[in-house]
């Protein structure tokens, strides 16, 4: 297992399979962009990598969806968060949460290959798909319910879809929802937001 | 081979004002500028992207200091206000051709220039 030692007091080692879904709608400037990355480089030096402990996968939406990292990549630690900040830019009209759900529900987590472990979606939007791209959202939610994934909303800046942060909220009682005003609200929220997926994974169970 | 050079660096007054120019010699992506007081380590200041204009400002130059560019010049400037004497530093510009790295670190940008020196004068 390709492990490193830890930069911060605050480590998560757990069984955990986080996915990280970053929104690339114009709704963010490529400055905000730029932020919500340096966010996800933040939680990720915070989280115990490792083919054994807590794997990442790191997927950007649009209008579909393009992986830059996914669960079974055999890398260090410090690659992956290199790979995390270079995901691009793509600035389009429209990001689509649904199509980045039904991406996670049967790319993501197709096979469950970790029972034992967590499944965490942490959904980043910070815009609206439009009303035709949506009409399968909630199945999508359900599925990834039905599958143990849980999906937890953070919602930056005025744009972003409250009606379906409030949807994905009701299917679960872990399903839970953090509201931002804007990027730069990201970084007081990281330790939160890390320590609350962190409870949510098992330990490890002692050797026998 | 990007160039970059800085000028516009001096002796200052506190709560006085300078502005930093750096010409680049080719296309650049994202240009930031950073500094490095004395004694101390390089710190990121502020970045401007090519895509759409925006910008990200350290904290502790926010409200002070603003990024800007010139695409047409090939210029990027640091306008800086209410100057105190811990903005005293050497600036440094720096350009990205690609993404790896987050927009405050270093080892983000490909390009650097010589650096000008700032003093602020209590």
């Known amino acids: 297992d390709i492990s490193e030692p830890p930069l911060h007091d605050f480590y998560c080692s757990r069984l955990l399979d986080l996915v990280f879904l970053l929104d690339g709608s114009s709704r963010l400037s490529e400055a905000e962009f730029e932020v919500l990355k340096a966010f996800v480089v933040d939680m990720m030096e915070r989280l115990r990598i490792s083919q054994k402990w807590v794997r990442v996968a790191v997927v950007e939406y649009h209008d579909g969806s393009h992986a830059y990292i996914g669960l079974k990549d055999r890398k260090r630690p410090s690659e992956l968060r290199r790979i995390a900040s270079q995901v691009k830019y793509a600035g389009s009209q429209v990001a689509s949460t649904s199509e980045v759900l039904k991406y996670t529900l049967f790319q993501i987590f197709s096979k469950i290959d970790r029972p034992e472990a967590s499944r965490i979606a942490l959904l980043l939007m910070a815009s609206q798909e439009p009303q035709r791209m949506s009409r399968n959202f909630v199945r999508y939610v359900q599925g990834l319910k039905k599958k143990k994934v849980i999906v937890i909303p953070v919602g930056i800046g005025p744009h972003a879809n409250l009606k379906q942060i409030r949807l994905i909220e009701k299917q679960a009682p872990e399903n839970k929802a953090f509201v931002l005003s804007s990027v730069d609200e990201l970084e007081q929220q990281r330790d939160e937001i890390v320590s609350y997926l962190c409870d949510l994974a098992p330990e490890a169970p002692p050797p026998t | 081979q990007v160039q970059l050079v800085e000028s516009g660096g001096g002796l200052v007054q506190a709560g006085g004002s300078l502005r930093l120019s750096c010409a680049a010699s080719?296309?650049?992506?994202?240009m930031a500028w950073f500094r490095q007081p004395p004694g101390k380590e390089r710190e990121f200041v502020a970045v401007i992207y090519s895509s759409d204009g925006s910008t990200l400002v350290a904290a502790s130059v926010t409200g002070r200091f603003t990024i800007s560019r010139d695409n047409a010049k090939n210029m990027v400037y640091l306008q800086m206000t209410s100057l105190k004497p811990a903005d005293t530093a050497v600036y440094y510009c720096?350009?990205?051709?690609?993404?790896?790295?987050?927009?405050?670190?270093?080892?983000?940008?490909?390009?650097w220039g010589q650096g000008t020196q700032v003093t602020v004068s209590s």
């Open positions: 080719g296309r650049t992506k994202d």
């Open positions: 720096a350009s990205s051709r690609g993404y790896s790295g987050t927009y405050y670190s270093t080892s983000r940008y490909d390009y």
